[in-house]
């Protein structure tokens, strides 16, 4: 039975040209995390394999940085980065857990940042 839950940064906003940390946290399970995929609807941004380390898709290599932890830092944001992002936790023996983050990239210099992510 899958007992885990994923906590995410939820809906966040950031300024064009700035950077943002996408962060998820899996809790309430003893399952082993084997891999975390960071994805948009139709493409892979990055993979963090617990054993093999990071893979970053070439189209994002110049503006995505791995971490902190299993999170992902998006840099040099453009309005085209607005949209849904998914953290997909591959675990054993539970299976797959998915978290969703909505990022809005604002033209304005007064972008209101969502509450900072905290792991309780």
């Amino acid at each position: 039975m899958m007992t885990g839950t994923i906590e995410t940064t939820g809906n966040i906003s950031a300024e064009k040209g700035g950077s943002i940390i996408l962060q998820c946290h899996l809790s309430s399970t003893t399952a082993q995390v084997t891999q975390v995929n960071w994805e948009q609807q139709d493409q892979l941004l990055a993979i963090c394999n617990a054993d093999l380390g990071w893979h970053i898709s070439p189209s994002f290599k110049d503006r995505v940085a791995p971490g902190p932890g299993l999170g992902l830092t998006l840099q040099s944001l453009t309005v085209n980065d607005t949209g849904e992002y998914f953290c997909i936790y591959h675990t054993y023996p539970d299976g797959t857990y998915t978290g969703r983050i909505f990022l809005e990239v604002l033209e304005s210099s007064v972008a209101e940042h969502g509450a900072r992510f905290q792991i309780p």
Epitope: T34, Q35, N37, E39, D42, Q43, L44, I47, N49, A50, D51, L52, G53, W54, H55, I56, S57, P58, S59, K61, P66, H90
Partner: antibody, heavy 119, light 107 residues
Amino acid sequence: QVQLVQSGAEVKKPGASVKISCKTSGYTFTEYTLHWVRQAPGQGLEWIGGINPNNGGTSYAQKFQGRATLTVDTSTSTAYMELSSLRSEDTAVYYCAGSGYYDYSFAYWGQGTLVTVSS
Amino acid sequence: DIQMTQSPSSLSASVGDRVTITCRASQDVKNAVVWYQQKPGKAPKLLIYSPSYRYTGVPSRFSGSGSGTDFTLTISSLQPEDFATYYCQQHYSTPFTFGQGTKLEIK
């Protein structure tokens, strides 16, 4: 330039073990993940597993879990693959392959090591 | 495990022909697919990755496309040195798996 040079051909009896080396040069050893792939005569490519020289983390295909052991020696920039309890079906060319920085594509390949298992 | 199925298994073509090889994943692998070329007695060589980027030194006649479960490798105008076996591979999740290969032969 990046080079992966493997040890020479081996002939082994069923039940024995074989250990193949892959000496790397031309890059910082701990930056690239190293994988092992095999190819039986006339057959396709099969991923055995990979190792991250930075932390020694290993990932194996289920089929080889417990029978293959991947290790590295960072002092000599060399990776090793040991396969135990050999059987005739393990007769194959074994390749080491390196994937680049933050990348899982196998950009660099050794020349291959033929392992023949025969009684 | 994710299965990668290539078609066709073998293909006869002539120099100058346009050739397309397809690869289908058993589940969504986004854009985490690469293509290799292998000649007899030699190690494979990386051709295309992610899945439309040509690796360094690969001629522009090679191109890749696709996302999700369906991927293609296209050679726009076959050259004599292109006759080889081609493999797709997914690296979306371990174990990394290869297609069974497509052998491209001279007609």
